[in-house]
């Protein structure tokens, strides 16, 4: 049940305007934030219960402003945060400690970025510093879709300092996109 | 433990604004987003808005897009509401309460509430 | 917008009762329905989550269930402590909206 929500608002360099799908899944592991946490509560349906078409992702809209160092966008950007319950709950209650166990097999459907579209933004800078124009990356769409367990494995790479250090009685929760790594994915438009 | 501590109770004039605060302690702040709803004597619960502290994001019901201003400070782990103009109408308790998007997608711990009381 | 309608404003049944409080969606939620707790002036507190997720804590009297617009908060065994009123709340698309509540009290 962990796994499900993916969120991208990092504002990225892209290649032209418009709408274009995902990158495969293996690229996706630096781009999305993988929100991995379980919190220890039992799953909340039979494993294998439903069909998965029973299951469908959250698309959250939120508005928010562009930021890069002191420049801040003109106007505000909308955005989408994938996040959802994509399939059964795919571990396994851990009695000691009320954790949680990866079901060590079987595909995994999790809620992430479908579509993105390039928006460019103007950003304006205080002191005098001339706007600057952007093009950033936009998640437009989600879907629920089937990851294997070699793409779970390899996500647990990139879980950074805070795996390090994981809630008790809680699987470890990636941390966001800092504002640099967003900062260094702002690119000139020009 | 997780905690969500807010402002203590306000009794404001007519056409002014207040500023109720919401410290998040016990868990990572920008990893879970905030929601703020409001509940007038009585009644039942109003969704406000949600703020996702990581990048400043937010949404808001139409019904308070000219009335409140959701902010969060990452630094203090502390989100913000500023409403505005006020009203008698706005009198209530607001309750700010945290989302886990990734897992449980409900609001699963609230803050005590603040009353906002409005009269001249 | 989604309105999430709970038909019964209050609700009045003896101690060891079994209760059903039920709670409707304008359109489809896709069980992302939630159930909350509020005794007389106290805070709020998650029940029930994704239709039928105990929070931990929650005793086992209570239960969840439903599909598609339809959901319903079963106690199976009431309990002076669930003297409380109960919202639900669509958690699928902001805005999120809450039902009017449910008051439930002792015969």
């Known amino acids: 049940q962990g796994w499900q929500a993916f969120k991208n608002d990092a504002t990225e360099i892209i290649p032209e305007l418009g709408e274009y799908p995902e990158p495969p899944p293996e690229l996706e592991n630096n781009k999305t934030m993988n929100r991995a946490e379980n919190g220890g509560r039992p799953p909340h349906h039979p494993f294998e219960t439903k069909d998965v078409s029973e299951y469908s992702c959250r698309e959250l809209h939120f508005t928010r402003y562009v930021t890069d160092g002191p420049c801040r966008s003109a106007k505000p950007v909308t955005e989408l945060v994938c996040s959802g319950q994509c399939g059964p709950a795919r571990l396994l209650p851990n009695a000691i400690g009320r954790g949680k166990w990866w079901r060590p097999s079987g595909p995994d459907f999790r809620c992430i970025p479908d579509r993105y579209r390039a928006q460019r933004v103007q950003l304006l800078c205080p002191g005098g510093e001339a706007p600057r124009a952007r093009k950033v990356r936009l998640v437009a769409s989600c879907k629920c879709k089937r990851l294997t367990r070699f793409h779970n494995q390899s996500e647990l790479k990139d879980f950074g300092t805070e795996a390090a250090r994981p809630q008790k009685g809680r699987k470890p929760r990636p941390r966001a996109r800092s504002a640099k790594a967003n900062q260094a994915e702002l690119e000139n438009a020009y | 433990q997780v905690q969500l501590q807010q402002s203590g109770a306000e009794l404001v004039r007519p056409g002014t604004s207040v500023k109720v605060s919401c410290k998040a302690s016990g868990y990572v702040f920008i990893n879970y987003f905030i929601e703020w709803v409001k509940q007038r004597p009585g009644q039942g619960l109003e969704w406000i808005g949600v703020i996702n502290p990581e990048n400043g994001g937010t949404n808001y019901n139409e019904r308070f897009k000219d009335k409140a201003a959701l902010t969060a400070d990452t630094s203090s782990s502390t989100a913000y509401m500023q409403l505005s103009s006020l009203t008698s109408d706005d009198s209530a308790v607001y309750f700010c309460?945290?989302?886990?998007?990734?897992?449980?997608?409900?609001?699963?711990?609230w803050g005590q509430g603040t009353s906002v009381t409005v009269s001249s | 917008d989604i309105q999430m309608t709970q038909t019964t404003s209050s609700l009045s049944a003896s101690l060891g009762d079994r209760v059903t409080i039920r709670c409707r969606a304008s359109?489809?939620?896709?069980?992302?329905l939630n159930w909350y707790q509020q005794k007389p002036d106290g805070p709020v507190k998650l029940l029930i989550y994704?239709?039928?997720t105990l929070t931990s804590g929650v005793p086992s009297r209570f239960s969840g269930s439903g599909s598609g617009t339809d959901y319903s908060l079963t106690i199976s065994n009431l309990d002076q402590e669930d003297i409380a009123t109960y919202f639900c709340q669509q958690g699928k698309t902001f805005p999120f909206t809450f039902g009017s509540g449910t008051k439930l009290e002792i015969k």
């Open positions: 994704y239709t039928s």
């Open positions: 309460a945290r989302e886990d998007y990734g897992d449980v997608y409900a609001m699963d711990y």
């Open positions: 359109q489809d939620i896709s069980n992302y």
